[in-house]
Interface confidence: low
């Protein structure tokens, strides 16, 4: 496929990803795949810098990313490694807790309204950030 | 420019109560997270307590859970720090301080009220 | 709980002088450490957050550095201001701990 060298419209360009912020509300797996479709992925945050730049865009706005725990330990989408990389859980969290009454535990991470991260119910509605990467290969056929 | 001002220390036998006040301006205090810190005379620093910027979620160091409470009001832009049941090495200066919105750090501190528990 | 240990205790030396501190965490706390500077009878101020990052108008001359366990803050020149007592904090869960502190006199 052809290399992607400038961001989407209505995408933001910062450190050579771009970003898309949703203003609606859709379910973690809904969103993931909303990403997909757009030929990106749920973000992936691997600093504090990136962290900070999401943190802006998002507000304090309950938002879906690229982190679960689904299939027992946490993983990052994009399949960056989880336990050497950036983190920024609330202090106590993730507890994966079953006291919300809505079955199973949480195991879906979120930025919180003060940016730190929650994990909670996979299935409530919060809005999500999509990222990709740019100068990677698009998913496109080249235009013959 | 942000303020944090402490009031309500002073001199409480062993045994009794005192309500600390941390009185905020400059910033927007319903966005963020407060803390208070307390030093004894000549010692380190030592972290109380924290409350969320909504009041949702408080925690406390050992030595004083079930004996202090914080609290906030956000409509008055004031922290506070009930403290029941003072002993005498409650002792210290008490600061509040805020909390960046990223991580628990703390990126503007008050002056400090001094408590001195002794009979 | 996560234990700060800082070393030393205290220092002297000399303006001009290059003075590291260094901090350990009892586990692993990753970026998750802070460093203030006190002066007798004031509050704390924040010198550094996240390990390495300068907070906003502290001189360049301060600056740190490690993650994981192993954390040190350094002052490439000392300056007469800069005589204090300098803390780490960890910030990765509660209840957040502070090192014992680095009082850094004039020699």
């Known amino acids: 496929g052809s290399e992607r060298t400038c961001c989407p419209v209505n995408w933001v360009e910062h450190e050579r990803s771009c970003y898309w912020f949703s203003r609606s509300g859709k379910a973690w797996a809904d969103a993931d795949n909303y990403c997909r479709l757009e030929d990106a992925h749920l973000v992936v945050v691997t600093s504090w810098e990136e962290q900070k730049f999401v943190q802006h865009h998002i507000g304090p706005v309950n938002t879906w990313m690229g982190l679960h725990d689904q299939n027992g330990p946490w993983k990052w989408v994009d399949g960056t490694d989880y336990e050497t990389g950036f983190k920024n859980w609330r202090p106590e969290q993730p507890d994966d807790w079953y006291g919300h009454g809505l079955g199973g535990g949480e195991d879906c991470a979120h930025f919180t309204d003060d940016g730190r991260w929650n994990d909670d119910v996979c299935q409530r509605p919060y809005r999500w950030v999509c990222e990709t990467e740019l100068d990677k290969a698009s998913q496109e056929p080249p235009l013959l | 420019q942000v303020q944090l001002v402490e009031s309500g220390g002073g001199v409480v036998q062993p045994g009794r109560s005192l309500r600390l006040s941390c009185a905020a301006s400059?910033?927007?205090?319903?966005?963020?997270?407060m803390h208070w810190v307390r030093q004894a005379p000549g010692k380190g620093l030592e972290w109380v307590a924290v409350?969320?910027?909504?009041?949702?979620?408080?925690y406390y160091v050992d030595s004083v859970k079930g004996r202090f409470t914080i609290s906030r009001d956000n409509s008055k832009n004031t922290l506070y720090l009930q403290m029941n049941s003072l002993r005498a090495e409650d002792t210290a200066v008490y600061y509040c301080?805020?909390?960046?919105?990223?991580?628990?750090?703390?990126?503007?501190w008050g002056q400090g009220t001094l408590v001195t528990v002794s009979s | 709980d996560i234990q700060m240990t800082q070393s030393p205790s205290s220092l002297s030396a000399s303006v001009g002088d290059r003075v590291t501190i260094t901090c350990r965490a009892s586990?692993?706390?990753?970026?998750?450490l802070n460093w203030y500077q006190q002066k007798p009878g004031k509050d704390p101020k924040l010198l550094i957050y996240?390990?390495?990052s300068l907070h906003s108008g502290v001189p360049s001359r301060f600056s740190g550095s490690g993650s994981g366990t192993d954390f040190t803050l350094t002052i490439s020149s000392l300056q007469p201001e800069d005589f204090a007592t300098y803390y780490c904090?960890?910030?990765?869960?509660?209840?957040?701990?502070f090192g014992g502190g680095t009082k850094v006199e004039i020699k």
């Open positions: 586990q692993n706390i990753y970026s998750y």
């Open positions: 996240a390990a390495s």
């Open positions: 409350i969320w910027h909504d009041g949702s979620n408080k």
């Open positions: 400059g910033f927007t205090f319903s966005y963020y997270g």
């Open positions: 301080a805020r909390e960046n919105s990223s991580s628990y750090y703390f990126d503007y």
């Open positions: 904090q960890q910030s990765y869960s509660t209840p957040l701990t």
